[in-house]
């Protein structure tokens, strides 16, 4: 069961539903972006492979004071089996490459859409 708490989900939902809603939230962010997202903050790039949800959260959690991605952070925490806190890094980060949050979101969105189309929900 995927359980995304807080403002994200009313309770446990199927993995496909959770992924669908995460994709829609990322679409929301990209569509509604006017000024530079999170004031142009930079985050570590990640390898979009197994364990990427935790890696994505570890990267984005270091961005503070950016309301636009708070819901995404909460939703990603529902996909990550362990608690993630700022300053925590896994081997999935490409530690020599930082990119803007806006680009990070676009890359993540493209990859998640591909997974969704291919039926890879877990």
């Amino acid at each position: 069961l995927t359980c995304l708490g807080g403002f994200a989900s009313p309770g446990p939902v199927p993995p496909s539903t959770a992924l669908r809603e995460l994709i829609e939230e990322l679409v929301n962010i990209t569509q509604n972006q006017k000024a530079p997202l999170c004031n142009g903050s930079m985050v570590w790039s990640i390898n979009l492979t197994a364990g990427m949800y935790c890696a994505a959260l570890e990267s984005l959690i270091n961005v503070s004071g950016c309301s636009a991605i708070e819901k995404t952070q909460r939703m990603l925490s529902g996909f990550c089996p362990h608690k993630v806190s700022a300053g925590q890094f896994s081997s999935l980060h490409v530690r020599d490459t930082k990119i803007e949050v806006a680009q990070f979101v676009k890359d993540l969105l493209l990859h998640l859409k591909k997974l969704f189309r291919e039926g890879q929900f877990n």
């Epitope: 199927p14 496909s16 539903t17 994709i23 829609e24 929301n28 569509q31 039926g119």
Partner: antibody
Framework: EVQLQESGPGLVKPSETLSLTCTVS????????WNWIRQPPGKGLEYIGY???????YYNPSLKSRVTISRDTSKNQFSLKLSSVTAADTAVYYC????????????WGQGTTVTVSS | DIQMTQSPSSLSASVGDRVTITCHAS??????LSWYQQKPGKAPKLLIY???DLHTGVPSRFSGSGSGTDFTLTISSLQPEDFATYYC?????????FGGGTKVEIK
């Protein structure tokens, strides 16, 4: 109360494109997920795909190469186009709503019958 | 795709009978199963979601159970308006798929 109403031609020639529209009243297509489902005569239900409140789409891989779902927010409508139709596409076509964070269809249109024949 | 198999495909019953319909999923779908009722010439209507949760306005004679791969829809005391075809649907993964239907006829 949200209501859905399908409309479109009841007869389409083989190899042509089937075009249907679903009009949503009592709610906005800028929330939730808006789906198409079909039912061939005397058979079960087949999921076609959705368009989301953001305009994002998903299509059943079995039909993906032929399907387009689009929307017109100013008219509160969403549409289905199915190209290169054959007799196997003859069915009752339903539009249905799926609310955010859910995976079941709680509101359906009454359905419209489309026959593919020359 | 996840295949949904319903049994029986049809059954005959009398008013007041207890009726049971089963739905089998080709893989584990946890509790992500819904049931619909369809009458001739009408759209399906949602009865049950999450395997056992009754949709708003659905009479309590309808109940659902099961998890994993095997599910059951039960009508405790069949009423004249219950003669219809019933479909199950999985929400575990896209594309969503439906069972082939069970037609409940008057004996």
């Amino acid at each position: 109360e949200v209501q859905l109403q399908e409309s479109g031609p009841g007869l389409v020639k083989p190899s042509e494109t089937l075009s249907l529209t679903c009009t949503v009243s009592g709610g906005s297509i800028s929330s939730d997920y808006w789906n198409w489902i079909r039912q061939p005569p005397g058979k079960g239900l087949e999921y076609i795909g959705y368009i989301s409140y953001n305009g994002n789409t998903y299509y059943n891989p079995s039909l993906k190469s032929r399907v387009t779902i689009s929307r017109d927010t100013s008219k509160n409508q969403f549409s289905l186009k199915l190209s290169s139709v054959t007799a196997a596409d003859t069915a009752v076509y339903y539009c249905a709503r799926l609310a955010k964070w859910t995976w079941y269809f709680d509101i359906w249109g009454q359905g419209t019958t489309v026959t593919v024949s020359s | 795709d996840i295949q949904m198999t319903q049994s029986p495909s049809s059954l005959s019953a009398s008013v007041g009978d207890r009726v049971t319909i089963t739905c089998h999923a080709s893989q584990n779908i946890n509790v992500w199963l819904s049931w619909y009722q369809q009458k001739p010439g009408k759209a399906p209507k949602l009865l049950i979601y999450k395997a056992s949760d009754l949709h708003t306005g659905v009479p309590s004679r309808f109940s659902g159970s099961g998890s994993g791969t095997d599910f059951t829809l039960t009508i405790s005391s069949l009423q004249p308006e219950d003669f219809a075809t019933y479909y199950c649907q999985q929400g575990q993964s896209y594309p969503y798929t439906f069972g082939g239907g069970t037609k409940v006829e008057i004996k």
